[in-house]
């Protein structure tokens, strides 16, 4: 297992609809054809696999069937979007990238993106 650098933004604010997007960029030392990306949430004394996708370079990301994530890839960048977030989902979201094929296997783990989620205020009753 060889180490690889992964970069991601330090902070992201989710939209009022509970959607957060960020870019995960990895410094590929070679020409990987199969890449696996996993997003981990670390907060509240929990470590959760939020979503995971395996993709062939140049193809769409295929997330596992339970996924609340969508994403696209472009070169060594993965654009990730997490949907349906609630205020309690605020936490550190870590991007883990594995270059699965061809050998050698590379593993990179980012420093994490702190995602802040604010539940929308209910609309006040209107007289109109």
């Amino acid at each position: 297992c060889k180490a690889m650098h992964v970069a991601q933004p330090a902070v992201v604010l989710a939209s009022s609809r509970g959607i957060a997007s960020f870019v995960c960029e990895y410094a590929s030392p070679g020409k990987a054809t199969e890449v696996r990306v996993t997003v981990l949430r670390q907060a509240d004394s929990q470590v959760t696999e939020v979503c995971a996708a395996t993709y062939m370079m140049g193809n769409e990301l295929t997330f596992l069937d339970d996924s609340i994530c969508t994403g696209t890839s472009s070169g060594n960048q993965v654009n990730l979007t997490i949907q349906g977030l609630r205020a309690m989902d605020t936490g550190l979201y870590i991007c883990k990238v594995e270059l699965m094929y061809p050998p050698p296997y590379y593993l990179g783990i980012g420093n994490g993106t702190q995602i802040y989620v604010i539940d929308p205020e209910p609309c006040p009753d209107s007289d109109f």
Epitope: R41, E49, V50, C51, A52
Partner: nanobody
């Protein structure tokens, strides 16, 4: 209505292992998010581990990751918790819980789970 029945609890010495099992009935099991929680007298239920509908995604309490492993068998309608290197502080009643909404969540809370088993006692002696 989903019903959950836990089994596998008991008395074990520190450093030992136990495997808990939870059998579900009454609904399509593969559409349910499952979890294990535990509770000691006078304390709130504490999250242990959770697993997504297909079993492809998991969540663990930070302090337990590496010792405990959650898994599920959708063909047999069961979810299991393998507990290794048990410590006296793992002594608790362990509850199986189901979220029939089935949506995977980054943060796991007891309030997300509407169906609970009766619990199984795990006692770890020193």
């Amino acid at each position: 209505e989903v019903q959950l029945v836990e089994s596998g609890g008991g008395l074990v010495q520190a450093g030992g292992s136990l495997s808990l099992s939870c059998a579900a009935s009454g609904r399509t099991f593969s559409s349910i998010t499952m979890a294990w929680f535990r509770q000691t007298p006078g304390k709130e239920r504490e999250f242990v581990a959770a697993i997504s509908r297909s079993g492809s995604l998991t969540s663990y309490a930070d302090s337990l990751k590496g010792r405990f492993t959650i898994s599920r068998d959708n063909a047999k309608n069961t979810v299991s918790l393998q507990m290794n290197n048990l410590k006296p502080e793992d002594t608790a009643v362990y509850y199986c819980a189901a979220d029939t909404n089935g949506r995977w969540r980054p943060a796991i809370r007891p309030s997300d789970f509407e169906i609970w088993g009766q619990g199984t006692q795990v006692t770890v002696s020193s």
